[in-house]
């Protein structure tokens, strides 16, 4: 089991095994660090991070987002509904993470690592939600055609899509982290 950590997140040489919730928390923070590394390359490479034309591109994307009805916010918090939303959202993000795989020159391995670490996070959460049957898996055919569509965009739109995926994924994970800490 990954080691425990102190408040500074330093690898303590002597540790107790982490609880299931601590492991999930740590895994999400690990992925968030990976997203930060990828965002650095995206923002250095283009001016997308300051662009005001995001709304235009965002309309073409159906990126998972937390809403009031999902029960993940402090007001109207619902553990079961929220957990289903987190897992469903992560499963929906997988096609977008696949799209990112060919979008980075110097950070190719980082993009792969974010994708694989997310697969592990999904495994952790599916165990936590093993009694919940309301989790729908995205249709592979729909995902395949979405991927083809995204890859056929012009360069500017592909850069914007990359930026939006990373930003949305970061926001989704941050919301998930806050919600999971209440569970």
């Amino acid at each position: 089991v990954p080691p425990g950590e102190d408040s500074k997140d330093v690898a303590a040489p002597h540790r107790q095994p982490l609880t299931s919730s601590e492991r999930i928390d740590k895994q999400i923070r690990y992925i968030l660090d990976g997203i930060s590394a990828l965002r650095k390359e995206t923002c250095n490479k283009s001016n997308m991070c300051e662009s005001s034309k995001e709304a235009l591109a965002e309309n073409n994307l159906n990126l998972p987002k937390m809403a009031e009805k999902d029960g993940c916010f402090q007001s109207g918090f619902n553990e079961e509904t929220c957990l289903v939303k987190i897992i469903t959202g992560l499963l929906e993000f997988e096609v977008y993470l696949e799209y990112l795989q060919n979008r980075f020159e110097s950070s190719e391995e980082q993009a792969r690592a974010v994708q694989m670490s997310t697969k592990v996070l999904i495994q952790f959460l599916q165990k936590k939600a093993k009694n919940l049957d309301a989790i729908t898996t995205p249709d592979p055919t729909t995902n395949a055609s979405l991927l083809t569509k995204l890859q056929a965009q012009n360069q500017w739109l592909q850069d914007m899509t990359t930026h939006l995926i990373l930003r949305s994924f970061k926001e989704f994970l941050q919301s998930s982290l806050r919600a999971l800490r209440q569970m």
Epitope: V1, P2, V10, A11, Y30, S36, M116, K127
Partner: antibody
Framework: YYQLVESGGGLVQPGGSLRLSCAAD????????MSWIRQAPGKGLEWIGQ????????VYNYNVLGRFTISRDNSKNTLYLQMNSLRAEDTAVYYC?????????WGQGTLVTVSS | NIQKTQSPSSLSASVGDRVTITCRAL??????LAWYQQKPGKAPKLLIY???HLHYGVPSRFSGSGSGTDFTLTISSLQPEDFATYYC?????????FGQGTKVEIK
């Protein structure tokens, strides 16, 4: 004296199955997570998956997910790796290791060859 | 297999030399890094954990340093039994990943 001893390796055809065992001795087996790690001939190390001390939680690397299953019998101090739908690229030496995030004790390894 | 950058991939050195191997993590991993030594036909052996803590029984000529993304394994005075392949491993998150390895050969 800590000891981990793997067994069950051998030659298997593509699509076949194999179960590896890892017998532990010298430490409180149920108190530790355990991992399986493999090394293809002449290549580096690759983590396969992990099982918690109680056996209640498992997690796998993406390339074996759905094909490999890790289990343990704490009454027998034994760890298992059930490998199904084996492929040529699964050919490797398979190690079991005590898992505290890093791997402080390893078995000697058992060779699995997937070939027709 | 996702791999971190470990360098060099191989090096030639003489007994008594000071040897330094570096490992760069894909992103910030605090000090969740371990180093292993592996000899041909044998299982890896843990040398260093938590970036700089020496595993018990490991000679004091081995030392580790670094945090964040950049890490170093140093052998202060190379001994005949130290000719082997060395791997780094991150355990900040799953899947655990290893460096590609550095083979230390006799000059």
């Amino acid at each position: 004296y800590y000891q981990l001893v793997e067994s069950g390796g051998g030659l298997v055809q593509p699509g076949g199955s194999l179960r590896l065992s890892c017998a532990a001795d010298g430490f409180l087996f149920s108190g530790y997570a355990m991992s399986w790690i493999r090394q293809a001939p002449g290549k580096g190390l690759e983590w396969i998956g992990q099982i918690s001390g109680s056996g209640g939680s498992t997690v796998y690397n993406y390339n074996v997910l759905g094909r490999f299953t890790i289990s343990r019998d704490n009454s027998k101090n034994t760890l298992y790796l059930q490998m199904n739908s084996l492929r040529a690229e699964d050919t490797a030496v398979y190690y079991c290791a005590r898992d505290t995030g890093y791997f402080d004790h390893w078995g000697q390894g058992t060779l699995v060859t997937v070939s027709s | 297999n996702i791999q971190k950058t470990q360098s060099p991939s191989s090096l030639s050195a003489s007994v008594g030399d000071r040897v330094t191997i570096t490992c760069r993590a894909l992103w910030h991993i605090s000090s969740y890094l371990a180093w292993y030594q592996q000899k041909p036909g044998k299982a890896p052996k843990l040398l260093i954990y938590a970036a700089s803590h020496l595993h018990y029984g490991v000679p004091s000529r081995f030392s580790g340093s670094g945090s964040g993304t950049d890490f170093t394994l140093t052998i202060s005075s190379l001994q005949p039994e130290d000719f082997a392949t060395y791997y780094c491993q991150q355990y900040s998150g799953l899947p655990y990943t290893f460096g590609q390895g550095t083979k230390v050969e006799i000059k």
